[in-house]
């Protein structure tokens, strides 16, 4: 482990109330194949426990959805991925919206320090599948 | 090599017959950019020799496409990648549908075994493209 | 260094003239969360400084966008990634289409070598965001 | 060797109905599809659809919804195109064709069936 | 639907002639394009798929070739066993559909 090989593989376990947009995720041999090596859950969201360089990812499918589902509401369904806190360093790192389709997947390279916590934020009326196949979220140390 | 550092990418050879959803994949450098260096190919399929944790991802783009010709039909077009040997292992790690676009394109962490073969199942009558930067298919070993 | 850990993550400067369909990247961290370890730029293109194995992944998405905006239009918005110089070189290594969506992102396992300049390019008449959060691209040396 | 062994020749009556056989061996049935391709003088070769010998889902080309019916005896490793009232235009040589390792691409074709339909 | 256009319905060549046969679709089929071969008695073979792979047990002497919307079927030495009629075939949706054939005859 102190190679700074830190990773996680994240599945969704619940979305939070109606104010409330962030995704709330679980990891852990015993829920599938998601699991937890260096950085840690608090309240369902992911902090990170070494510095470095990491790949973001991300997979998110709306879970009764059409094409039609996801183009006729005003507001579009919209999933970010950002540092919630600390707040002084808050930021939204990657953003992506459904317009017609009823999945995002993306990835990014970002800087990462200790003590930060990674929010996924869902908003619109939209519910994400829980099943493990198709929502999913994961970092990976990849350099210091 | 002793450092595990397991990857394939590998592009697309041809589909399956119709009862059959599998993709057939094919790789080496006389190919094109597409290689394999550690994994192996068993009949088109991709199969793991080293245990870790693998970022696997794919990017597969319908030949004949447009909007209307992945939303008209009954059945949607889906994307599977998952564990389909041996038998007592057999998992869906990836899931996506076409709806009305014409590229899937994904990625995800999960834990692998030597031995695993990989399946990609492409559900539906639309035909993927055997452009080399259109379909695509690859694993990276990550970690132990 | 020394340990072949070449890495960038890339974000959106400007686009090309009308004639000219590259994207122009910058990075560093007084811009924000880019940044370019190894790598570097020449006139926005990013030039690759070690052999290797990379994963390549982008995120585009466009400005002004809707999915009426990007169906209506005759010739497809198109991004294309691929090494455009040395010419001896030069090939296409990943291409999307948008059809009814408003965002691309995906990522592969490519071989490049010292020398080789990476060009994105984006056809049709749509213009990407610049937000660091929607467009952005990188490389990641992965193994020799 | 595989082989694909259509039934002989029919002469039916419009009106009528007619069932052609196509018997499989060398492989296993279920496991490959089975397609219907039409052929006529003056129209050339035309897909009819498939059946889904595992599960035995037919799938119809627009043409052929209605009259025609693709079925399975699976024990006998046979397929069957019935068609129902025929008409005059249905009066063609039809094939039963199986694919390999490609999808739609057929490597094993029947020897043909000629319907003439004729009052 | 995607029309298939073989605008040669005969062909006359001699023995030993290269021969080739053209094909056109009503749109861009990505090379998911098949040749078969019909003998007078009704036969019909598998001759190449996916433009250019030659299927097995094949003599070598053909080959296929194109991209797009145009292909074509050559026969580099024509030998008295290849004379037939040539049909192509898009492979790359449903309904799938064929030329009108292309019949090779001796001259």
């Known amino acids: 482990e102190s190679l700074g090989w830190d990773i996680a593989e994240l599945q969704l376990n619940h979305t939070g109330p109606q104010q409330d947009p962030r995704l709330y995720w679980q990891g852990g041999p015993a829920l599938g194949r998601s699991f937890l090596r260096g950085p840690e859950l608090d309240k369902g969201q992911l902090r990170i426990r070494r510095d470095g360089i990491y790949m973001v990812h991300i997979q998110v499918t709306l879970a009764i959805c059409s094409s039609t589902s996801t183009s006729r509401h005003h507001h579009p369904t919209t999933l970010a991925v950002g540092i919630c806190s600390p707040a002084s360093r808050s930021i939204s790192l990657l953003r992506l919206s459904f317009h017609q389709g009823c999945t995002i997947a993306s990835q990014r390279l970002t800087p990462l320090a200790r003590g930060d916590t990674l929010c996924t934020n869902l908003t619109g009326t939209l519910l994400p599948s829980r099943n493990t196949d198709e929502t999913f979220f994961g970092v990976q140390w990849v350099r210091p | 090599e002793s450092l595990g550092w397991d990857i394939a990418e590998l592009q697309l050879n041809h589909t399956g017959p119709q009862q059959d959803p599998r993709l057939y994949w094919q790789g080496g450098p006389a190919l094109g950019r597409s290689f394999l260096r550690g994994p192996e190919l068993d009949k088109g399929q991709l199969r793991i020799r080293r245990d870790g944790i693998y970022m696997v991802h794919i990017q597969v783009t319908l030949a004949i496409c447009s909007s209307t010709s992945t939303s008209r039909h009954h059945h949607p077009t889906t994307l599977a990648v998952g564990i389909c040997s041996p038998a007592s292992r057999s998992i869906s790690l990836l899931r996506l549908s076409f709806h009305q676009g014409c590229t899937i394109a994904s990625q995800r962490l999960t834990p692998l075994a030597r031995g695993d073969t990989l399946c990609t199942n492409l559900t539906g009558t639309l035909l993927p493209s055997r452009n080399t930067d259109e379909t695509f298919f690859g694993v990276q070993w990550v970690r132990p | 260094e020394s340990l072949g850990w070449d890495i960038a993550e890339l974000q959106l400067n400007h686009t090309g003239p009308q004639q000219d369909p590259r994207l122009y990247w910058q990075g560093g961290p007084a811009l924000g969360r880019s940044f370019l370890r190894g790598p570097e730029l020449d006139k926005g293109q990013l030039r690759i400084r070690r052999d290797g194995i990379y994963m390549v992944h982008i995120q585009v998405t466009l400005a002004i966008c809707s999915s009426t905006s990007t169906s209506r239009h005759h010739h497809p918005t198109t991004l294309a990634v691929g090494i455009c110089s040395p010419a001896s070189r030069s090939i296409s290594l990943l291409r999307l289409s948008f059809h009814q969506g408003c965002t691309i992102a995906s990522q592969r396992l490519t071989p490049l070598a010292r020398g080789d300049t990476l060009c994105t390019n984006l056809t049709g008449t749509l213009l990407p965001s610049r937000n660091t959060d929607e467009t952005f691209f990188g490389v990641q040396w992965v193994r020799p | 060797e595989i082989q694909l062994v259509q039934s002989g020749p029919e002469l039916k009556k419009p009106g009528e109905t007619v069932k052609i056989s196509c018997k499989a061996s060398g492989y296993t049935f279920t496991n490959y599809g089975m397609n219907w391709v039409k052929q006529t003088p003056g129209k050339g070769l035309k897909w009819m659809g498939w059946?889904?010998?595992?599960?035995?889902?037919?799938t119809y080309a627009d043409d052929f919804k209605g009259r025609f019916a693709f079925s399975l005896e699976t024990s006998a490793s046979t397929a069957y195109l019935q068609i129902n009232n025929l008409k005059n235009e249905d009066m063609a040589t039809y094939f039963c064709a199986r694919e390999e390792d490609y999808r739609y691409v057929f490597n094993y074709w029947g020897q043909g069936t000629t319907l003439t339909v004729s009052s | 639907d995607i029309q298939m256009t073989q605008t040669t319905s005969s062909l006359s060549a001699s023995l030993g002639d290269r021969v080739t046969i053209s094909c056109r679709a009503s749109q861009d089929i990505s090379n998911y394009l098949n040749w078969y071969q019909q003998k007078p008695d009704g036969t019909v073979k598998l001759l190449i798929y996916?433009?250019?792979r030659l299927h097995s047990g094949v003599p070598s002497r053909f080959s296929g070739s194109g991209s797009g919307t145009d292909y074509s079927l050559t026969i580099s030495n024509l030998e008295q066993e290849d004379i037939a009629t040539y049909f192509c075939q898009q492979g790359v949706t449903l309904p799938l559909t064929f030329g009108a054939g292309t019949k090779l005859e001796l001259k």
């Open positions: 996916y433009t250019s």
């Open positions: 059946i889904n010998t595992d599960t035995g889902e037919p």
